[in-house]
């Protein structure tokens, strides 16, 4: 499709033509103040230097002002998430100004050309903000730029170019190609606003990473490790194999960042929490469910600005759809002994019973091999609020059913033909809730019977000695 003004150079050429031959200049970046929740409403187009539309459309100088910045597009038309985000912002912040930054003419290009256009779009936003700052009562501190994909880097440029410091930039899965590893002035970075929070939902360490992998904000949140999002697998999005393509999976995972942000706006009573961790594997092991020293935070709109944090990587698990919130638990299981285990890797399953609800049977993901005579840490999460935990049912199986494991099991059996039965000895389970930060210890129901064979179950109840309960220092976020 045609580029009316393309990168900065072309725009400059166009503007410096002699008046006589200057073509009609249509702005390639438009600012639409969404004055109504009604999608049919045309809104108000703001124009640099023209104060009348601000007055006519009731621009509130003292209120929060959101600028929503879309990304690269393969269609010349807004994508559906935009309506959801605008609507959610209007619902949550009734007096706020919600401005859609429409740069479709410059975004509906080859990706490389759209990337080259991000700077000029960022500059346009900065100029608009500089002009607004000349008005009485308008404060840059009340400005929140929300950029999706390529739009996140546009927001970065805007924050970099503006006179002063923007209050907040939220990067929703900032684009990866041509930005990964780039200099801080050529991508979104913590210097671009007073607070920069980022959601990463489509990062890949192999193949093309649509979203940027590196941390680029004050806090960088990686839901589900920042890669495979629940509900976005091929089976989930295709409905039936006759319909859809891999493109739908990409869209689902990349766009998930937007929906997580929308969720944080509309489901205020169901906030999702993320936990600081050095990497995804450690988080999967359940090591990082601490709220001490600002190590946890709400995600999305409710995220709290953390002082002195830069590039702080945070992780959480989510549901497949709204509300995305799950309840995280760290489980520490001390395996006292193996009996006749050979080379078999156990796979644990737990069912949690609470005052509000009971969980489904949950597998404990093994990130590293189970250690004997050692405490093994796992992460489990439930979609429902179980309330206070009352008891835990534990079972285990010999191996996950891969050909390699089946071969190991067969080899183990052949080496011990008189295998008298494999057993594990587990006496207690220590549990910590990520959301409440409460710690509990669960003891085997029958202290004399703590051995468990594959397929059998072992029950654990809260230990009698004051439940061995501890509370960590109060988290800095408002936990429910």
């Amino acid at each position: 499709s045609p580029t009316p003004f393309g990168p900065e150079g072309q725009l400059a050429d166009e503007l410096h033509k002699p008046k006589a031959i200057q073509t009609e200049v249509k702005p390639s970046v438009r600012f639409n103040l969404r004055t109504s929740k009604d999608p049919e409403h045309e809104g108000c187009y703001l124009s640099l230097g023209h104060s009348q539309p601000l007055e006519d459309c009731g621009f509130n100088m003292t209120a929060k002002t959101f600028f929503i910045i879309h990304g690269w597009t393969m269609s010349g038309i807004f994508e559906n998430w935009l309506h959801k985000l605008v609507s959610a912002l209007h619902t949550r912040e009734k007096d706020a100004n919600v401005v859609v930054v429409d740069w479709l003419p410059l975004a509906h290009q080859l990706y490389t050309d759209a990337v080259n256009n991000t700077r000029v779009v960022g500059h346009s936003i900065a100029r608009m903000l500089d002009w607004l700052q000349e008005k009485d009562d308008f404060s840059l501190g009340n400005v929140h730029l929300i950029g999706y994909s390529l739009g996140a880097h546009v927001a970065g440029y805007a924050g970099n170019f503006v006179k002063g410091t923007v209050g907040r930039i939220t990067g929703l899965d900032p684009a990866g190609p041509m930005f990964e590893g780039a200099d801080i002035h050529k991508r979104l970075s913590p210097d671009d606003a007073d607070f920069v929070d980022v959601l990463h939902t489509y990062t890949r360490s192999f193949g093309l990473s649509i979203g940027i992998q590196m941390p680029v904000g004050h806090i960088d949140i990686y839901p589900n490790g920042g890669d495979f999002q629940p509900g976005c697998g091929l089976n989930d999005v295709l409905g039936s194999m006759a319909y859809g393509t891999i493109t739908e999976v990409v869209k689902c995972e990349h766009e998930r960042a937007v929906h997580l942000f929308v969720d944080s706006l509309v489901n205020q009573d169901k906030p999702s929490f993320a936990f600081q961790c050095t990497d995804s594997n450690r988080f999967k092991k359940g090591i990082c469910l601490s709220c001490r020293k600002n190590r946890c935070n709400s995600i999305g709109y409710n995220a709290k600005k953390m002082r002195n944090k830069r590039n702080s990587k945070m992780y959480l698990k989510t549901r497949a759809g709204m509300p995305f919130r799950v309840y995280h638990y760290q489980m520490k299981i001390h395996v006292f002994s193996y009996k006749n285990m050979g080379e078999i890797e156990p796979t644990f399953y737990v069912t949690l019973y609470g005052t509000n609800a009971d969980s489904q049977t949950l597998p404990l993901e093994i990130v590293e091999r189970i250690e004997q005579n050692a405490t093994n840490t796992f992460l489990v999460y439930t979609e429902e609020d179980l309330g206070d935990l009352l008891k835990i049912q534990l079972t285990w199986e010999g191996a996950s059913q891969s050909w390699y494991n089946l071969w190991k099991e067969l080899r183990s059996y052949l080496s011990q033909p008189h295998n008298p039965g494999r057993e594990l000895n587990i006496r207690r389970i220590r549990v910590k809730s990520g959301e409440t930060q409460r710690k509990l210890t669960f003891c085997a129901e029958d202290p004399e019977n703590t051995s468990i064979s594959p397929g059998r179950e072992l029950w654990f109840r809260k230990c009698r000695d004051g439940w061995r309960m501890k509370n960590e220092t109060s988290p800095t976020v408002e936990l429910p």
Partner: antibody, heavy 119, light 107 residues
Framework: QVQLVQSGAEVKKPGASVKVSCKAS????????MHWVRQAPGQRLEWMGG????????TYNEKFKDRVTITRDTSASTAYMELSSLRSEDTAVYYC????????????WGQGTTVTVSS | EIVMTQSLATLSVSPGERATLSCRAS??????LHWYQQKPGQAPRLLIK???QSISGIPARFSGSGSGTEFTLTISSLQSEDFAVYYC?????????FGQGTKLEIK
């Protein structure tokens, strides 16, 4: 009030092309997307594609991508849909429809243009 | 593409009664669902947008509900002019798709 007025009925031979026009009035033409939807006799409605009249950006249904071209003339506030390599199964009523700001729902429709493809 | 299914091809209801029409999406479309009414020889008419938002000029007896994959159009008290074909349409992702329609006929 918003009005979309389409060109008249067409009879075409297989392999030919047809170009249907849709003149908009009662609103700012460049502020809203324009979409084309067709309906074969007794069939469901089928979205063919849309255009952003502000700068001419288009998106098409893959099913028609190689055969359909949507254009606009902003000075005349008119959108066009051209369908080439016509076959008998393209016999249908073709509608233009004005999208909302986000292009999702269609509150205003043209009266429809009947295109008959017959040898 | 997202497949929209209107399970009832025809629904027979008496005037004055309530009519409930359903529409199912093959995957989650949140609230990006719109309902149209079409009478013979006429263009479709938008009744409900974004699952539940009413349209200016459309009688209050028309209401919509649902989210995700299951949606419902309810006509609280059928009038003679309501007997027509009703289509649902999703705008969650390209290509936009319509259901096959439900014909509402007089019982």
């Amino acid at each position: 009030q918003v009005q979309l007025v389409q060109s008249g009925a067409e009879v075409k031979k297989p392999g030919a092309s047809v170009k249907v026009s849709c003149k908009a009035s009662g609103y700012t033409f460049t502020d809203y997307t324009m979409h084309w939807v067709r309906q074969a006799p007794g069939q469901r409605l089928e979205w063919m594609g849309g255009i952003n009249p502000y700068y001419g950006g288009t998106t098409y249904n893959e099913k028609f991508k190689d055969r359909v071209t949507i254009t606009r003339d902003t000075s005349a506030s008119t959108a066009y849909m051209e369908l080439s390599s016509l076959r008998s199964e393209d016999t249908a009523v073709y509608y233009c429809a004005k999208g909302d700001y986000y292009g999702g729902s269609y509150n205003y429709w043209g009266q429809g243009t009947t295109v008959t493809v017959s040898s | 593409e997202i497949v929209m299914t209107q399970s009832l091809a025809t629904l027979s209801v008496s005037p004055g009664e309530r009519a409930t029409l359903s529409c199912r999406a093959s995957q989650d479309i949140s609230n990006s669902l719109h309902w149209y009414q079409q009478k013979p020889g006429q263009a479709p008419r938008l009744l409900i947008k974004y699952a539940s938002q009413s349209i200016s000029g459309i009688p209050a007896r028309f209401s919509g509900s649902g989210s995700g994959t299951e949606f419902t159009l309810t006509i609280s008290s059928l009038q003679s002019e309501d007997f027509a074909v009703y289509y649902c349409q999703q705008s969650n992702s390209w290509p936009y798709t319509f259901g096959q329609g439900t014909k509402l006929e007089i019982k």
